[in-house]
């Protein structure tokens, strides 16, 4: 039997894919759980596998079409349960009414490229990948650049308060390799969370000019 | 058995407000997922407000900012309190509770009230 709390948190992609986290203390053990989707207005249904990500947490990922279809809309309601194997039965252990548009976590940005470095400055862009169009320019960016000696967490935050996907950074130091992450986010949705980061993009600021010999 | 019970129907002007109650007899110590839905006059079924067993809210957009679904845990009562009423909300009402795991609790199991009209004149 299963007491204790239990957290089913999910997450739309804003295209195809709406991934799903659940934990549970005092869970089941050795037992195989699913996420079903529902749409109240939709032909379709699907169902996806959990798989273990630590103690008392299982994770995964619904995958509702090709990834940039737009399978749902701000006006889709998807009851989402989390059903657990138990001999012949599923039992069902939790269930929301899930509003896509509300809970919102895009992909990571991709495509990082420097664009121009100098001795101080360097220019990068990117891009976002399987965003909706629905979005059109509403959406907003984090960005952070990696210094030698310091940790990412130490690292100050630039935010980029509209779709922009490029940065100048300033005040480099010459000829020092650096790393660059960014981060995506609609500005819609009462539970919209950012992205993940995307993979670092390394560079290094060029060597200050040589003074002439005198 | 599990027993619902739908009242607090009936016919109003637009603009006035109506509650509706939900009361699920049996099984009080279960958690449960409980849900109104609507059927207005040839119309198919739609969603319109669900409270979770952790209290999560969901609404429709098109009743967003104007229902508010409460629950009474102890005897498990639902309520949606319906504000601004227009003609577009004129339908059958049915509310439906979900039964989640726990000992002696008939989990996976959906129960649907009679449902209770609601009429919202011009």
């Known amino acids: 039997a299963v007491n204790g709390t239990s957290q089913f948190t999910c997450f739309y992609n804003s295209r195809a894919n709406i991934s799903c986290v659940w934990s549970q203390d005092g869970a089941l053990q050795d037992t195989s759980c699913q996420v079903h989707a529902w749409p109240d207005r939709r032909r379709w249904n699907q169902t996806c596998e959990l798989l273990p990500v630590s103690q008392a947490s299982w994770a995964c990922n619904l995958i509702l079409g090709a990834p940039d279809s737009q399978k749902l809309t701000t006006v889709d309601i998807v009851t989402l349960r989390v059903l657990c194997r138990e001999g012949v039965r599923w039992r069902v252990m939790a269930i929301q009414d899930f509003k896509p548009f509300e809970n919102l976590r895009l992909m990571a940005p991709i495509s990082l490229q420097v664009v121009h470095v100098e001795t101080h400055r360097c220019n990068i862009s990117w891009e976002i990948s399987q965003a909706s169009h629905y979005f059109e320019r509403h959406l907003e960016f984090e960005a952070r650049t990696l210094s030698p000696g310091h940790t990412w967490e130490e690292a100050p935050l630039l935010t980029l308060k509209q779709k922009q996907e490029w940065i100048c950074l300033e005040t480099l130091t010459p000829d020092t390799q650096y790393e660059f992450q960014v981060r995506v986010k609609p500005l819609q949705g009462e539970f919209t969370t950012w992205s993940p980061w995307s993979q670092p993009l390394a560079f290094r600021t060029k060597p200050a000019a040589l003074g002439k010999d005198t | 058995q599990v027993q619902l019970q739908e009242s607090g129907g009936g016919s109003v002007q637009a603009g006035g407000s109506l509650r509706l109650s939900c009361a699920a007899s049996?099984?009080?110590?279960?958690?449960?997922?409980m849900t109104w839905y609507r059927q207005g006059p040839g119309k198919e079924r739609e969603f319109v407000s669900s409270i979770g067993s952790d209290g999560r809210k969901t609404y429709a957009n098109s009743v967003t900012g104007r229902f508010t679904i409460s629950r009474d845990n102890a005897n498990h009562t639902v309520y949606l309190q319906m504000n601004s009423l227009s003609p577009e909300d004129t339908a059958m009402y049915y509310c439906?509770?979900?039964?989640?795991?726990?000992?002696?609790?008939?989990?996976?199991?959906?129960?649907w009230g009679q449902g209770t009209q609601v009429t919202v004149s011009s």
């Open positions: 439906k509770t979900e039964y989640l795991y726990g000992l002696g609790c008939p989990d996976g199991s959906a129960y």
């Open positions: 049996g099984y009080e110590y279960c958690r449960i997922h």
